[in-house]
């Protein structure tokens, strides 16, 4: 058993059919030494009396708001969570796995640029009784501090029969070095409750590797004297390190017919600007990479050629 | 919202055997984890059993361990109780539930519930 924080407790359960459970020891904050009994949440069934209340705790029905009280006074409160085990492994039932880049991936994370800033979001199917605590470091053993906000729902989606809820959360690193080579690990840890039931997430990265930089700006489209062609520009995205002479991007452009069949027009780039052949009912789009480490692309910036 | 419809009750004779069903709508069942209750006349609800939302997990309740078995078809969106060896004192209606809890005997920790199929065991 450990503390969460004040007066809320998690129970490690190895839990099979027929386990034991953990016995748990829970002690009344109070100088009080007699007359003192204990009840579990609303009911006003007596479970022991004195300082001290010994349970064990098999399932979920174990666990909830223990209060100990006196002469119908409230002295303290603990309330107990459930962390569950099943066949050595810690339960994920809180969040939905992404399987994106690969299965088991349940927080994803983003940044715009090196600046240290991050976005963290993951998804569930739960509405209610729901709460998240993030936390976040360079390094384990000897961490670096990184600033996190209050997770936040930052979506809704249908998929299916059920509703999908999406929460999303930014952080900073407190001392950031965006020119530095970073040879320690981001680490993210995520804390989920549900109703009575805890469970832990975390993620390890490198801010290079979960770089994706915004979609290219003021994307343009000049027509060229007695000609097809046109010359298409764009900017840096405003959220881009800088300098850019340092933190260089390259493109990628598309010329895409109105139907998804027809064949692709591609030219990359390490300039803001490219000649291509605009073919009527097309568009033009430009994304962005950094141009020194494979990281993501962007999303496209699109403009129609006519 | 999840509903849920309980059939398969009846009226049996001591020592024989019956199988519940309790098919969800509304919702797919893969992300809850479902029960059985039952409630005999002037006593509260009881806890039956309970399996996990990948049907890997069970628990029942010591009077029926050994006699029924829960089990679930999450295609079919239906979970099962088979009650064998059955007692005059199975006698109550059974309940399905749904939660996001496993295992739990506790009804508060269910979300939803059926309305309820009548089991009578003659003596």
């Known amino acids: 058993i450990w503390e969460l924080k004040k007066d809320v407790y998690v129970v490690e359960l190895d839990w099979y059919p027929d386990a034991p459970g953990e016995m748990v020891v829970l002690t009344c904050d109070t100088p009080e030494e007699d007359g003192i009994t204990w009840t579990l949440d609303q009911s006003s069934e007596v479970l022991g009396s004195g300082k001290t209340l010994t349970i064990q705790v098999k399932e979920f029905g174990d666990a909830g708001q223990y209060t100990c009280h006196k002469g119908g006074e409230v002295l303290s409160h603990s309330l107990l969570l459930l962390h569950k085990k099943e066949d050595g492994i810690w339960s994920t039932d809180i969040l939905k796995d992404q399987k994106e880049p690969k299965n088991k991936t349940f927080l994803r994370c983003e940044a715009k640029n090196y600046s240290g800033r991050f976005t963290c979001w993951w998804l569930t199917t739960i509405s209610t009784d729901l709460t998240f605590s993030v936390k976040s470091s360079r390094g384990s053993s000897d961490p670096q501090g990184v600033t996190c906000g209050a997770a936040t729902l930052s979506a809704e989606r249908v998929r299916g029969d059920n509703k999908e809820y999406e929460y999303s959360v930014e952080c900073q690193e407190d001392s950031a070095c965006p020119a530095a080579e970073e040879s320690l690990p981001i680490e993210v840890m995520v804390d989920a409750v549900h109703k009575l039931k805890y469970e832990n997430y975390t993620s390890s990265f490198f801010i290079r590797d979960i770089i994706k930089p915004d979609p290219p700006k003021n994307l343009q489209l000049k027509p060229l004297k007695n000609s097809r062609q046109v010359e298409v520009s764009w900017e840096y995205p405003d959220t881009w390190s800088t300098p850019h002479s340092y933190f260089s991007l390259t493109f990628c452009v598309q010329v895409q017919g109105k139907s998804k069949r027809e064949k692709k027009d591609r030219v990359f780039t390490d300039k803001t600007s490219a000649t291509v052949i605009c073919r009527k009912n097309a568009s033009i789009s430009v994304r962005a990479q950094d141009r020194y480490y494979s990281s993501s692309w962007s999303e496209w910036a699109s403009v129609p050629c006519s | 919202e999840v509903q849920l419809v309980e059939s398969g009750g009846g009226v049996v004779q001591a020592g024989e055997s019956l199988r519940l069903s309790c098919a969800a709508s509304g919702r797919s069942l893969n992300n809850e984890e479902m029960g059985w209750f039952r409630q005999a006349p002037g006593t509260e609800r009881e806890f039956v059993a309970t399996i996990s939302r990948r049907g890997t997990g069970t628990y029942y309740a010591d009077s029926v361990k050994g006699r029924f078995t829960i089990s679930r078809d999450n295609a079919k969106n239906t979970v099962y109780l088979q009650m064998s060896s059955l007692k005059p004192e199975d006698t109550a209606v059974y309940y399905c539930?749904?939660?996001?809890?496993?295992?739990?005997?506790?009804?508060?920790?269910?979300?939803?519930w059926g309305q309820g199929t009548q089991v009578t065991v003659s003596s």
């Open positions: 539930a749904a939660g996001q809890l496993f295992p739990s005997s506790r009804s508060r920790d269910y979300d939803y």
